[in-house]
C-alpha cells in the first residue's frame, strides 16, 4: 500500500475523527463534537470548528478606520448551534436560556434577551477587516511585497479566492486586510471570508487548524513576518441592533 | 493540492550513490515543507529528511545524517535527495511528500498531506 493510505487524516481541520470507510476505502473525517462529515479539501465552517473546540479537553493615512456599526468579538467561546450546512444558526442560546442573534460569523450583534427573542435570518458579514501589529524588524517590508505575499496566503493556504481580499494596507508596523464578500458574490465551493479569517486569527495566534504539530510560517521575501497584535472587525450587510445602553457603556 | 512524482530508484552496490527526484505539479510547491520518506520491508515509514520552503532549514533521521542530502529548486519545483555511502539497511520504498501551504513541518508523517507514489531504492552486492 502507499504512505498516502497510511496517512488517514483530514490536512484543513486536526479536530476531526478519520477513518477509511468511505466509497472504495476513502478516507472519510467527521468533526469532533458534531459528528458532521467534513471536506478535507476546503476549511471546515467556523460553526462547527467552535463546536470542536468546546467539546475538546479545555486546555494621510491609507488605514481604515472601522466603521461605527463594526463588531469586535468581545464574547469570546461558546458552543453554538450550527445548521445541517455547518452555518451558524441566526439564534443562540446558553444553557440558561439567554439567547442572542449572530452574524454569519457567529459574532452576537443584538442585546442578550430570553427565549422570547426572534431571529428572522442570519445576516451576512461581507466585510472583515483584520489589523496586525509585525514585530520590529530591521526595516519596513516592501509594502508590494508584503501585498502579494499576503494575497498568496489566503489564495493557498486558505484556498480563498484573490477577488475577495480587497485590499492590503500598511502603515509599519501596522498591517490591514480587508476581506469582503456580498451575498451575491459567494459561488458554490468558494470559501467564505469569515471562514479564512478565522484560520488567519488561530495561525496568528500560534493555535493552526490544519493537520500535523506544525504552525504558520510567512515570510516576505524571506524575512519572517512575525505578529505581536490582532485585531479583527466584522461588518454585516445590515447594520446591528444594539440598545443605547450597551453604547453608552 | 500538488501531484508529486518520484524518480530516480534502482539497484545499487553497498557504498554506492543515487539521487532521487520528486517532480511536483501546482504553483503552492515553493511554499511548502518538502520531505522524503521510506519503508523498509515490512516496517512502518520512516522519516528521512525535510526542508523548508526556502532551502534554509533542513532535518535529518540519525540514520542518515552525514550520508543524505536534501535540496530543492523551487524555479524547477523538484526536489531531491542526494544518497551517498548506501547500506543494505536502506533498502526501502521512498517517498516525496509535502506540507500543507506555509505549514511548518518535521520529521513526522503527520505534518505532511500531499504524497507520491514511491521509487523503490535496492542496496545489494
Known amino acids: 500500500h502507499t504512505a498516502a493510505q497510511d496517512n488517514c487524516t483530514c490536512p484543513t481541520n486536526k479536530m476531526t475523527v478519520c477513518s477509511p470507510d468511505g466509497p472504495g476505502g476513502r478516507c472519510q473525517c467527521r468533526a469532533l463534537g458534531s459528528g458532521m462529515a467534513v471536506d478535507c479539501s476546503t476549511l471546515t465552517s467556523k460553526c462547527l470548528l467552535l463546536k470542536a473546540r468546546m467539546s475538546a479537553p479545555k486546555n494621510a493615512r491609507t488605514l481604515v478606520r472601522p466603521s461605527e456599526h463594526a463588531l469586535v468579538d468581545n464574547d469570546g467561546l461558546y458552543d453554538p448551534d450550527c445548521d445541517p450546512e455547518g452555518r451558524f444558526k441566526a439564534r443562540q442560546c446558553n444553557q440558561t436560556s439567554v439567547c442572542w442573534c449572530v452574524n454569519s460569523v457567529g459574532v452576537r450583534r443584538t442585546d442578550k434577551g430570553d427565549l422570547s427573542l426572534r431571529c428572522d435570518e442570519l445576516v451576512r458579514t461581507h466585510h472583515i477587516l483584520i489589523d496586525l501589529r509585525h514585530r520590529p524588524t530591521a526595516g519596513a517590508f516592501n509594502h508590494s511585497d508584503l501585498d502579494a505575499e499576503l494575497r498568496r496566503l489566503f489564495r493557498e493556504r486558505y484556498r480563498l479566492h484573490p477577488k475577495f481580499v480587497a485590499a492590503v494596507h500598511y502603515e509599519q508596523p501596522t498591517i490591514q486586510i480587508e476581506l469582503r464578500q456580498n451575498t451575491s458574490q459567494k459561488a458554490a465551493g468558494d470559501v467564505d471570508i469569515g471562514d479564512a479569517a478565522y484560520y488567519f486569527e488561530r495561525d496568528i495566534k500560534g493555535e493552526s487548524l490544519f493537520q500535523g504539530r506544525g504552525g504558520l510560517d510567512l515570510r516576505v521575501r524571506g524575512e519572517p513576518l512575525q505578529v505581536e497584535r490582532t485585531l479583527i472587525y466584522y461588518l454585516d450587510e445590515i447594520p446591528p441592533k444594539f440598545s443605547m445602553k450597551r453604547l453608552t457603556a | 493540492q500538488v501531484q508529486l512524482q518520484e524518480s530516480g530508484g534502482g539497484l545499487v552496490q553497498p557504498g554506492g550513490s543515487l539521487r532521487l527526484s520528486c517532480a511536483a505539479s501546482?504553483?503552492?510547491?515553493?511554499?511548502?515543507?518538502m520531505g522524503w520518506f521510506r519503508r523498509a520491508p515490512g516496517k512502518g515509514l520512516e522519516g528521512v529528511s525535510v526542508i523548508s520552503p526556502y532551502g534554509d532549514s533542513t532535518y535529518y533521521a540519525d540514520s542518515v545524517k552525514g550520508r543524505f542530502i536534501i535540496s530543492r529548486d523551487n524555479s524547477k519545483n523538484t526536489l531531491y535527495l542526494q544518497m551517498n555511502s548506501l547500506r543494505p539497511e536502506d533498502t526501502a520504498m521512498y517517498y516525496c511528500?509535502?506540507?500543507?501551504?506555509?505549514?511548518?513541518?518535521?520529521?513526522?508523517?503527520?505534518?505532511?498531506?500531499?504524497w507520491g507514489q514511491g521509487t523503490l531504492v535496492t542496496v545489494s552486492s
Open positions: 501546482g504553483s503552492t510547491y515553493s511554499r511548502r515543507y
Open positions: 511528500a509535502a506540507s500543507w501551504p506555509y505549514q511548518t513541518a518535521s520529521l513526522d508523517a503527520m505534518d505532511f498531506t500531499d
